[in-house]
Every structure is written in C-alpha cells, then in structure tokens.
Amino acid sequence: HTAAQDNCTCPTNKMTVCSPDGPGGRCQCRALGSGVAVDCSTLTSKCLLLKARMSAPKNARTLVRPNEHALVDNDGLYDPDCDPEGRFKARQCNQTSVCWCVNSVGVRRTDKGDLSLRCDELVRTHHILIDLRHRPTASAFNHSDLDAELRRLFRERYRLHPKFVAAVHYEQPTIQIELRQNTSQKAAGDVDIGDAAYYFERDVKGESLFQGRGGLDLRVRGEPLQVERTLIYYLDEIPPKFSMKRLT
C-alpha cells in the first residue's frame, strides 16, 4: 500500500506522478525529475524532493526560492545527484564542472573545487537545530504544552519517532527544536531527521509537500502558533572542511 489506491495519489509527496502500473495493478508513484519509485507511506528523501523541485517548470512552480537570510544552507537551491536509494551523493557538481562535498542533508561542507575533488563518504548530519520565531501573541505559550504539541507534530505528521526529538526550548518568541539521530540509532524504516526537518521547513513556509492533507495548522491549547522566520543549523558527525579564507 505505497499509495492511495482509490484515486492513485501519493499522500506524502505531491511532486510525483502516479499510475496503477505496480504489481497486481497497484498504484505506484514516481518522483518528478528522477523517476524514482517512492514509498508513499513515509516521507520522500530531501534529495529526490529537491530534484523534483528543480525539474518543475519555472512558471508552474508553486514554490519560492528561500530568502537568503532564512537558511544557514547559504547555497540555496541546486539540482542534486541522488543515489538509487534517494540519498544525496557525497559529491555534487554543477553544469560548469564546479564540485563540492555535501552532508546527508545536501548542505555543502567543503570549499568548491573542480572535477578532481574527492568526497570519500557521505557524512551524516546527526544533530539539527531548528530555530523559529513565532508571531506575537497575547501571552507566551506554556512551555510544556508547546513541547508536547511539537513532539506530537513530528511523530504524527512527519512520522519521526519521539526519541529523535532531543529537546524543545522556548524563550518567547524563539522556539528551538533539537533533532538528534546518530547512524547507530537509525533503524531501517526510521524517518531521517534531515527529511523531517525539510518537510517541516516547507510546511512553515506554507509550501506543504503533502498531497490532499491540509497545510500545517499548529495550535497550542487552541491558540495558533504562526511562524514568521526559520533558521536551520546542521551539525555533522565529522566537522566540515572549509579553508580559513572562508571563515574570515
């Protein structure tokens, strides 16, 4: 049951083409841009989603390029190379043969080089800090209620196990959600924290990737939580390798 049988759509990824041509006439969905078959009972990998986003015709694209200040992923959008499982390939290159190494969430972790650049392994991002600022409210949210609702959101909407939500911090109006997932902790079938963070990021921007499910409607004790800016910080299991020039 990888997709909704009745009308053959993918509940977890609207950027797919679905048809009843799977085994036994079952609904099968393929990601736009790559044609890779996706499991519609879980989140699609960020790599395949970025590829689909880049393949959409410019005028039909309902999604906007992130504001420069909104992401620590300063390079913004690019058309990534994904492996057969939908993960980012460790080395990414553009059409002008400029190459760089990325981590498991597709964020550049080295200086840019040429085709001779080697990226020996895909380094895992094991800690993600999602930094949000919410719109002004009459009073601050109750921290424990906010904590509970965000943990439930990540479990129920993004299917991320609660054990990977390390902490929820709150100092009005700033909310920080910490996701942690080491290679050893991630079992087969577990949603990757990078994919969950990407879906959440798109949700708070009003660019939901879900098909037919309403947009994100986050409420704490009935009070809507509206996000006005998002910053996401990525920490890798192996520190990134940038030259000192970039750091000055």
């Epitope: 049951h1 904590d147 439930r152 479990r155 129920e156 609660p162 939500v165 929820v168």
Partner: antibody, heavy 118, light 109 residues
C-alpha cells in the same frame, strides 16, 4: 518482554488512586506507554499516553485534569486518578506501542481492577 | 477522529466468513489496527496499517480499506475465533475521545 499493572482497589466515590505499570525485558525509552480502560461488559476506552523520551503526556478529552500519567523510574509508569466516581469502575490496562510512530499496541499488561463504590 | 464499528454482534457457523466494518470520522491514512479480545484477557494485536498481519496471526484474518472505511474479514471461522474485535486508529492522539471502535462480538455456532 512483559507489562504488569498493580494498585487496583475498591475505593469510595471522590477518592484518589494511583496505578503502577511495571515493564520488564525492554527499554522504555524506545516506546510510548498508553493506558486503556474497560468497564465491565463494555468496550475499550483510551485514557492517555506518555512519550517516554521527552516525557510529554496526552489525554483523551474526557480524561484531562483528572488523570495524570508519569514515568516514575526507568521501568515504571503510573496513572494517577482523582475524584473517582462509579463510572470509573473498570479494568485498567497499560500497554506499549510497537515502536513505530503509529499508536499500535502490541504489548499489554493483564489489567488491574478498580471498583468505585460506597 | 471517532471510530464507528459495525455490527455490534455477529453469529456465524464454523467454516463461515465474518465481515466487520470500521468507519473513521476523518481520513486516517490507513493507520488502523484490529485487536482480538477474549474474556478475562487483554486485547491482542491482529492487524496494523490496515492490512498487515501481526506476528503469528493466521492468514484467515484479512484487513483492507483506506481513507475512512476499513474492513476486517475472518474466513474459515474456527471456534477459537469467538471473541470481541476492536478497531483502533493509530493516526493521532490529539483532541480525541477514544481511539477505539465500540467492538464487535463474534459468536461461532
């Protein structure tokens, strides 16, 4: 792997009672624990849930305020109940989810009987 | 997310087939489980994700459905199948009264 409830008793209306669920053979931190009750001859009724990692709790709308779920040790979860009435007479089960992100209950305790009567 | 289960009771002979229906008030995206409960025992998980059999459950039990409509079918009824069956939505625990259906008693003649 097992669960066992204790603390069930005959109590008077208005009383409070705490039930304990003891887990054995698995790490609680990888699961959520839920409490479910069943009045004599009636169906299953979900009371509430605790995400062990994080300690956040969730309750059925009718249970908010009167029922409290807590993790009290590395192997025990409790259900505190206040202002008990005859309608709370039931067998109370603690159950564990299956480790996925859905709330499927694949391990149950045998249940403990709570009787509220004067 | 109310769960409405029908019928409340059904009686069929050994070897027969029983069909139990469960309707959710909203789409639960196939996140549905079925349980079997015998008197004096806790419930036992039979089926999860609408159609996947739990470990050790015979293939006579079949789950199907999507959206808001779900069905449990027990074919080749055996005396051991006499029990009460419950559906449960596993989609959300937010603002709900009960995640379980009302139950269906299966009597095997």
């Amino acid at each position: 792997q097992s669960l066992e409830e204790s603390g069930g008793d005959l109590v008077q209306p208005g009383a409070s009672l705490t039930l304990t669920c003891k887990a054995a053979g698995f790490d609680l931190n990888n699961y959520s624990m839920l409490w479910v009750r069943q009045a004599p001859g009636k169906g299953l009724e979900w009371i509430g849930c605790i995400y062990i990692s994080g300690g956040t709790t969730y309750y059925a709308s009718w249970a908010k305020g009167r029922f409290t779920i807590s993790k009290t040790s590395s192997t025990t979860v409790t259900l505190q109940m206040t202002s008990l009435t005859a309608a709370d007479t039931a067998t109370y089960f603690c159950a564990r989810d299956d480790g996925s992100t859905s709330y499927y209950l694949n391990l149950w305790g045998p249940g403990t009987l709570v009787t509220v009567s004067s | 997310y109310d769960m409405t289960q029908t019928p409340a009771s059904v009686s069929e002979p050994v070897g027969g087939t029983v069909t139990i229906k469960c309707q959710a008030s909203e789409d639960i995206y196939r996140l549905l489980a079925w349980y079997q409960q015998k008197p004096g025992q806790p419930p036992k998980l039979l089926i999860y994700d609408a159609s996947d059999l739990a470990s050790g459950v015979p293939s006579r039990f079949k789950g199907s459905g999507s959206g808001t409509e779900y069905t449990l079918t027990i074919s080749g009824l055996q005396c051991a199948d006499a029990a009460t069956y419950y559906c449960q939505q596993g989609y959300t625990i937010g603002n709900i009264d009960n995640s379980f259906g009302g139950g269906t008693e299966v009597v095997v003649k």
